[in-house]
Each structure stands twice: as structure tokens, then as C-alpha cells.
């Protein structure tokens, strides 16, 4: 995943006993939080890997490329990155892996310059449909976010909500149309059974979609139509059986896209001439020649471009008085 | 930002090849694809075909097929365009240009065919 | 080839005026039509993509329209620093292909 990149060569550590001193007053210029490696020649703060519990308030106000990751954060409440003097040049977050679970109404506020946020590998319970807006405006102001990496953030069955995952977090993501200008979206390793049919056609600016590695059975009912600019849908290590007709044609009008479709249990029926065809004729798909049938039982293995409409045949079914028990 | 630098003037005589260079920066938010555009002098724009930089799927204009070759080093952020059997209407300022709608352009690499 | 032609050539107008440009594409393009400057000894910059679509940091004076064949670009009051070279490209069917240009002036 795209997380922000540091160039950082000479990081300064600041002691630890000077964090509470100043913390309710405007760090100074070159002051490092406690726990963490500052360098303001890279624009970059480093607080990896140290169990904090919350967001530091002292971080310093030129700071670029924050990284978080690896703490024990649990809940990010709203303004958590507001100071005064606002952090204007913050561009890419990563709290990737620290171990929260509720992400609260405008958490992001105050970040004019947030471009790439990474979320990835925390158990997400609750994420605010204002996570991402700020206010629960129909029309809220447009986000900066330009790159959103939410991989991995599914939280253990037990401490899910009673309520779709899959809606929790397409609900952040409509909110107040706050997410126009998203171009990259990486959702992988979701669990996600279903997409919702209406998240993509609100998100007009997608050039990269990451749905890998969940359990997608079907897209009859999504549309790929409104993201004219669409460049790689990753659906890999998916549920997926088949491509139908109305998706192939979608796909095939997107002139700039790259479809990765490897590791999905293809079934090889007469349901799948129309995709067989299509991969035959088609060069947006990715590594094509390597995918193979999962079922039925005597087509495994077979590859999807070696397939005849003679191979792709339906058992037919019989009549209810023919069928034994 | 993306920025997309190219490298040097070339000049070279006719039968011979050129590899252009192009080094994005900003790469962050760029694009996966990077076209190549040439203009001769006082004329207009022709597309000569596109990489698709994770993968490495080309596009070429069917008029250039077999002359060109378009690669791309992901470690380094860099693409190439390279075009061989070089002629005298060969000469032009070549573009590279990031991104599915040619978002962000490069400053240019002018190409000069003489013998 | 999808050809795509550009109309007029060239024009003169005066500060504040309305400018319009006009593309014709040989068959239907779907919308995938981009508008580009460009000043004298520099690269093209895009304006505007798939029809109406202004690119980050572009002026709203600024605008498309247009559908299937037929395609316009207009500035709404033309401003000093807009000298220079306009040029349509489909982006729909490959190979990509532009207009041939029109070259705008003060007059």
C-alpha cells in the first residue's frame, strides 16, 4: 500500500521528561515529542512502535509525513490533530496498525493539506460517517484526501456492531460528498461479502480501486460506469465465480483501466462463455492467461483462455418428477 | 504535485536510436500511465503510445509499432521511450505525460535527426 | 483512426471577450475529450478532461461541453496570460489523437 514515504536522514529524539512541560502551549519550531524521531529537514515526525495512547498534542508545525504506527491509540477522537497553530502542512498520516477501534465524527478536522491518510490494520468497530466530512452537512466541505488506505481494518466478529460492516464504512466514505477528489481507495483484506451499489458512482474521481483479498461473490450490482478515469480494480483473492456481460461491457468502456482478477473461484458452466470470450478479445485484464477454473470438479485447473464453448456446458436440470431422492 | 522531469537534447543521425528518459516525482499521486507525445517543429501533437507502469502493458500508435519501445523502472520512478531507425521527420520535442488524460506533461526533450 | 477536427484555426479577440472552440470527432468518443494550452516554447498543460471536467488548479473561466461528435471549449472573458495554442484529444479509442489546434490571440 502507498504509505507515506520518509527521506528522513537525520532524525533528532527528543527526552522524554519535556512532554507534559509544554504541551498546552505552541511547540517550539524544533521540538520533538517524546517518543518520537523528528526530522525537519524531511518534514517527517516518527512515533513508531511506542505504545502511545494518544495522539501527541506538541507535534511540530512543519511537520509533512507523520507516522503513527504501531501504538496503542484505541480511540481517535474528534480534532485529534487540531493545534494552534493548525499543523497546515500535514499531507500523509499513517496510523496503520495502533490498535484502534473508534475513529470519531471530524477526527480529521483541521488538516488542510491531508492528501494520503492510512487507517490500515486496526479492528474498526466504529467508524464515524463523519470520520472523513466533519459534519453531518448533506454537502460538506470537500476533503483534501486524495489517497485513502483502509486495509485490513475489519474488527474480530465478536466486536463488530449489529450492523454491516460493509455499510459502516461505505457511510464514512459518502458522507456530506465529502471524498469527490479521493483518486486511490484501497479496501483489501475486508471480509467484504458485498460492495454496496451506490459507493462507486459517488466517488467520480477513483483511479485506483484495491478490493483484493475479501470475499466478493458477485458484481451484477455494481457499476464501474461513473469512474471514467479508473486505472486498476483489484479484485484478487476474491469469492467471484463469474464476470457477467453487463460488467465486462462496463470494464471494456474504460479506457485507462488495468482489471487483476488472479485466485478467484471461476466456474467453468455455460454461464462463463460470455467472459471467456471477453478475456480472449480483452488486454485490460491483467496476468490473464494465469486464471484457472475452480469448479466444476473436472474442469479444476483448466485455463480460462484454453476453454471452447463445447467445455462450457450445464448439467441440465431435470423436472422434479425425474429427480430421486 | 507531479512533477515529471526529462532528460537532455539529443542529437543523432539517421538509422540510429534515442531513449528518452522521464523521472516523475510527487509519484505519490501519480498515475500508473505514462504517455509519449511528440510535436515537430511548428506542427501540432501526435500520441505514440503509453506504459502502464506497475505491470509494464504497453499501447503503441500503430505507426510507430516495431520502432518504438516504451519501459518503465518502478524502483527508480523512471520511464523510457526508446525509437530506433531514426529519420530526418523523426525530429521533434518528445513529451512524456503522466496519467490516463495526459494530466501532467513533462518539460520536453527535443530530438534532432541530421546527417 | 479517430480523427478529430478543430475549428477555426486561429482567432483574435479582444480582453474580456468570449471564446469559443469548437471539435468535431470522426465517430462517437463517449466524453473522452480533453482540452489542452499551450504557450509558445512549453508543454501542453490539460485544462479540462472528459468534456467538462476542469483539472486541479485551472481557472472556472475555463469551460466544456458537448457530446458523442461534437465538442466546445469557451473562455469566459479571455484574459492576457490565456495567449496561446489550444488543442482537443479523444482519450476514448486508441490511438489517442488531437485537433490540429487553434492558436488564440489578442487582438
Known amino acids: 500500500s502507498s504509505s507515506p514515504t520518509s527521506s528522513a536522514s537525520s532524525f533528532s529524539s527528543s527526552a522524554p521528561f519535556l512532554a507534559s512541560a509544554v504541551s498546552a502551549q505552541p511547540p517550539l519550531p524544533d521540538q520533538c515529542p517524546a517518543l518520537c524521531e523528528c526530522s525537519e529537514a524531511a518534514r517527517t515526525v516518527k512515533c513508531v512502535n511506542r505504545n502511545l495512547t494518544e495522539v501527541p498534542t506538541d507535534l511540530p508545525a512543519y511537520v509533512r509525513n507523520l507516522f503513527l504506527t504501531g501504538n496503542q491509540l484505541a480511540v481517535l477522537p474528534a480534532g485529534a490533530f487540531a493545534r494552534r497553530p493548525p499543523l497546515a502542512e500535514l499531507a500523509a498520516l499513517n496510523l496503520s496498525g495502533s490498535r484502534l477501534d473508534e475513529v470519531r465524527a471530524g477526527a480529521f478536522e483541521h488538516l488542510p493539506s491531508l492528501r494520503q491518510l492510512d487507517l490500515s490494520h486496526n479492528p474498526l468497530a466504529d467508524l464515524s460517517p463523519f470520520a472523513f466530512s466533519g459534519s453531518n452537512a448533506s454537502v460538506s466541505a470537500p476533503s483534501p484526501l486524495v489517497e485513502l488506505i483502509l486495509n485490513h481494518i475489519v474488527p474480530p466478529e465478536d466486536e463488530r456492531q449489529n450492523r454491516s460492516f460493509e455499510g459502516m464504512v461505505v457511510a464514512a466514505l459518502l458522507a456530506g460528498r465529502a471524498l469527490q477528489g479521493l483518486r486511490r481507495l484501497e479496501l483489501a483484506s475486508n471480509h467484504f461479502l458485498y460492495l454496496p451499489r451506490d459507493v462507486l458512482a459517488q466517488l467520480p474521481s477513483l483511479r485506483h480501486l484495491d478490493l483484493s483479498n475479501n470475499s466478493l461473490v458477485s458484481l451484477t450490482y455494481v457499476s464501474f460506469r461513473n469512474l471514467t478515469h479508473l486505472e486498476s480494480l483489484h479484485l484478487e483473492d476474491n469469492a467471484l465465480k463469474v464476470l457477467h456481460n453487463g460488467t465486462l461491457a462496463e470494464l471494456q468502456g474504460l479506457p485507462h483501466i488495468r482489471v487483476f482478477l488472479d485466485n478467484n473461484p471461476w466456474v467453468c458452466d455455460c454461464h462463463m462463455a460470455d467472459m471467456v470470450t471477453w478475456l480472449k478479445e480483452t488486454e485490460v485484464v491483467q496476468g490473464k492467461d494465469r486464471l484457472t477454473c475452480a469448479y466444476p470438479e473436472k474442469m479444476r485447473n483448466r485455463v480460462l483462455l484454453e476453454l471452447n464453448s463445447a467445455d462450457l456446458d450445464c448439467d441440465p436440470i431435470l423436472p422434479p418428477s425425474l429427480q430421486t431422492s | 504535485q507531479v512533477q515529471l522531469v526529462q532528460s537532455g537534447a539529443e542529437v543523432k543521425k539517421p538509422g540510429a536510436s534515442v531513449k528518452v528518459s522521464c523521472k516523475a516525482s510527487?509519484?505519490?499521486?501519480?498515475?500508473?500511465?505514462m504517455n509519449w507525445v511528440r510535436q515537430a517543429p511548428g506542427q501540432g501533437l501526435e500520441w505514440m503510445g503509453r506504459?502502464?507502469?506497475?505491470?509494464?502493458?504497453?499501447n503503441y500508435n500503430g505507426k510507430f509499432k516495431g520502432r518504438v519501445t516504451m519501459t518503465a523502472d518502478k524502483s527508480i520512478t523512471t520511464a523510457y521511450m526508446e525509437l530506433s531507425r531514426l529519420r530526418s521527420d523523426d525530429t521533434a520535442v518528445y513529451y512524456c505525460?503522466?496519467?490516463?488524460?495526459?494530466?501532467?506533461w513533462g518539460q520536453g526533450t527535443l530530438v534532432t535527426v541530421s546527417s | 483512426d479517430i480523427q478529430m477536427t478543430q475549428s477555426p484555426s486561429s482567432l483574435s479577440a479582444s480582453v474580456g471577450d468570449r471564446v469559443t472552440i469548437t471539435c468535431r470527432a470522426s465517430?462517437?468518443?463517449?466524453?473522452?475529450l480533453n482540452w489542452y494550452q499551450q504557450k509558445p516554447g512549453k508543454a501542453p498543460k490539460l485544462l479540462i478532461y472528459?468534456?467538462?471536467r476542469l483539472h486541479s488548479g485551472v481557472p472556472s473561466r475555463f469551460s466544456g461541453s458537448g457530446s458523442g461528435t461534437d465538442y466546445t471549449f469557451t473562455i469566459s472573458s479571455l484574459q492576457p496570460e490565456d495567449i496561446a495554442t489550444y488543442f482537443c484529444?479523444?482519450?476514448?479509442?486508441?490511438?489517442?489523437?488531437f485537433g490540429g489546434g487553434t492558436k488564440v490571440e489578442i487582438k
Open positions: 510527487g509519484y505519490a499521486f501519480s498515475s500508473s500511465w
Open positions: 465517430q462517437d468518443i463517449s466524453n473522452y
Open positions: 505525460a503522466n496519467g490516463g488524460a495526459m494530466d501532467y
Open positions: 506504459i502502464y507502469r506497475e505491470d509494464g502493458h504497453t
Open positions: 484529444a479523444n482519450d476514448n479509442t486508441l490511438p489517442w489523437t
Open positions: 472528459y468534456t467538462s
